[in-house]
C-alpha cells in the first residue's frame, strides 16, 4: 500500500482543515488508514482523524482544531496499521479556504432597489471576520448569457443594485462567496443560491 | 463575553502554601490554554506556567518547578494554581491568562502577600 | 532579568507618535512571533498586538506593532492621555523548552 499522491490541506481557519490524497490503488480509507496530527505547542496532544473515501483510491480526512491562529503548526503521519506511509507538517494559515456566507436574502421592498444581504461566517474574535471581502454572483434562470459577478469590496456584508440593473418579469438567483487577502485564502464554496422574481416600475415616458 | 474570575487576596506566612483560583465563561473551557504569570510591587511581568485544560497536562518556568502545580476541574470550568514554600520575594499578583501563542484575556489577578 | 529589552520609560505630548523598541535574539523574537501587551494603572495587561502585527478586534489602528530580525517596535500615533501605562513585549524562547518570554516593560508618560 502507497500513496500515489501525497496529503494536501485547507483549513477553515476557525475549528476545521480537510485533507485529501490518493493511494496508489482501491481503498477502504476507514478501515485501512489513520491520520494523526498533532499542533507543534507544548502540552499539545495528538488527535486521530479517521479519513472517509472521496472515489476509489481518493481519501478525505476532517480534522478538528481549536483555536486556530496564524503561529500554529501541525504534524501530519498517515499511518496503514503499525506502517508509517507518510509523514508531513501543515500549517493552516498559509492554506485557507474560509467558511461561505449563509444567509443570503434579497430585500425586494426598497424602492426600484434590491438589497441582498448575507452573514459574515466568522465570529467577531476570529482574524477573518474583519478582513473578508465578497463576490456576489447574480444570474437570470431563462437567459444563461445573463449571468454577472459583483466585488464588494467593503466589510459590510450587502449589496445593493438598482432593479433597473436586472430585467423586469423574470426570475434571478444569487449567491455569494467570500476570500480573505490577508492570508491569501483561495475563494470560499458559494453559498446556497437564492431565487426571486424581478419587478420594478418603468419610469414613465415624459 | 470572556471572563476570567480569580480569588481573592490572600496573607501567607513564609513556608506554607497558597492556592489561587481562575474560573473561565463565555467560551469552550477545554479549547484554550491557560497561562500563570505574575508581577511583584513595581516590577514586570514573570511567566510561571500553563495548564492545557483539556487533558490537564502542565508545563512550569525551570524556576518554579518543585514549587508549582496547576490543575483544572472541567466541571466548573475553573482552572487552579498552587505555589508552596513561600518567601516573601513571592509577593506578587498572580495573573491567569488565556491564550496559546499569546494571551487574549486576563483575570484581574490576585495579590499574595507573604509576610511573617 | 529578562533577555527582551526595553527602554524603561518614553514621553511624548499628546497628539504626538511613540515608538517602544524590544530588542532580543535569534532564540526569540528572531524564531517567533510578538505581541504587546498594555498595562494601565492597577489593572491586568491587556494584549494589544499579536502575531507581530496585528490587532484584536476593538484595539484602535493608532496602534501598530512591526518586527524585523531580533528586534520588535509598537508605535503609537495620536498619542493620548488615556493611553499613559506600562508596556510589555512578549515572544517564545526556541533555544531549550518553549517557553513565553516577556520584555522588561516600558513606563510612557504623555505630557
Known amino acids: 500500500m502507497k500513496v500515489l499522491q501525497e496529503p494536501t490541506c485547507v483549513s477553515d481557519y476557525m475549528s476545521i482543515s480537510t485533507c485529501e490524497w490518493k493511494m496508489n490503488g482501491p481503498t477502504n480509507c476507514s478501515t485501512e488508514l489513520r491520520l494523526l496530527y498533532q499542533l507543534v505547542f507544548l502540552l499539545s496532544e495528538a488527535h486521530t482523524c479517521i479519513p472517509e473515501n472521496n472515489g476509489g483510491a481518493g481519501c478525505v480526512c476532517h480534522l478538528l482544531m481549536d483555536d486556530v491562529v496564524s503561529a500554529d503548526n501541525y504534524t501530519l503521519d498517515l499511518w496503514a496499521g503499525q506502517q508509517l506511509l507518510w509523514k508531513g507538517s501543515f500549517k493552516p494559515s498559509e492554506h485557507v479556504k474560509p467558511r461561505a456566507p449563509g444567509n443570503l436574502t434579497v430585500h425586494t421592498n426598497v424602492s426600484d432597489t434590491l438589497l441582498l444581504t448575507w452573514s459574515n461566517p466568522y465570529p467577531p474574535d476570529n482574524y477573518l471576520y474583519n478582513h473578508l471581502t465578497y463576490a456576489v454572483n447574480i444570474w437570470s434562470e431563462n437567459d444563461p448569457a445573463d449571468f454577472r459577478i459583483y466585488n464588494v469590496t467593503y466589510l459590510e456584508p450587502s449589496l445593493r443594485i438598482a432593479a433597473s440593473t436586472l430585467k423586469s418579469g423574470i426570475s434571478y438567483r444569487a449567491r455569494v462567496r467570500a476570500w480573505a487577502q490577508c492570508y491569501n485564502t483561495t475563494w470560499s464554496e458559494w453559498s446556497p443560491s437564492t431565487k426571486w422574481h424581478n419587478s420594478y416600475r418603468e419610469p414613465f415616458e415624459q | 463575553q470572556v471572563q476570567l474570575v480569580q480569588s481573592g487576596a490572600e496573607v501567607k506566612k513564609p513556608g506554607a502554601s497558597v492556592k489561587v483560583s481562575c474560573k473561565a465563561s463565555?467560551?469552550?473551557?477545554?479549547?484554550?490554554?491557560m497561562h500563570w504569570a505574575r508581577q511583584a510591587p513595581g516590577q514586570g511581568l514573570e511567566w510561571m506556567g500553563i495548564?492545557?485544560?483539556?487533558?490537564?497536562?502542565?508545563s512550569y518556568a525551570q524556576k518554579f518547578q518543585g514549587r508549582v502545580t496547576m490543575t483544572r476541574d472541567t466541571s466548573t470550568s475553573t482552572v487552579y494554581m498552587e505555589l508552596s514554600s513561600l518567601r516573601s520575594e513571592d509577593t506578587a499578583v498572580y495573573y491567569c491568562?488565556?491564550?496559546?501563542?499569546?494571551?487574549?484575556?486576563w483575570g484581574k489577578g490576585t495579590l499574595v502577600t507573604v509576610s511573617s | 532579568q529578562s533577555v527582551l529589552t526595553q527602554p524603561p520609560s518614553v514621553s511624548a505630548a499628546p497628539g504626538q507618535k511613540v515608538t517602544i523598541s524590544c530588542s532580543g535574539g535569534?532564540?526569540?523574537?528572531?524564531?517567533?512571533?510578538v505581541s504587546w501587551y498594555q498595562q494601565l494603572p492597577g489593572t491586568a495587561p491587556k494584549l494589544l498586538i499579536y502575531?507581530?502585527?496585528k490587532r484584536p478586534s476593538g484595539i484602535p489602528d493608532r496602534f501598530s506593532g512591526s518586527k524585523s530580525g531580533t528586534s520588535a517596535t509598537l508605535a503609537i500615533t495620536g498619542l493620548q492621555t488615556g493611553d499613559e501605562a506600562d508596556y510589555y513585549c512578549?515572544?517564545?524562547?526556541?533555544?531549550?523548552?518553549?517557553?513565553?518570554?516577556f520584555g522588561t516593560g516600558t513606563k510612557l508618560t504623555v505630557l
Open positions: 491568562a488565556r491564550g496559546k501563542w499569546w494571551l487574549y484575556d
Open positions: 502575531d507581530n502585527n
Open positions: 463565555g467560551y469552550a473551557f477545554t479549547s484554550y490554554y
Open positions: 535569534s532564540s526569540n523574537i528572531g524564531n517567533s512571533y
Open positions: 495548564i492545557n485544560p483539556s487533558g490537564g497536562s502542565t
Open positions: 512578549g515572544t517564545w524562547d526556541t533555544s531549550t523548552t518553549l517557553q513565553p518570554l
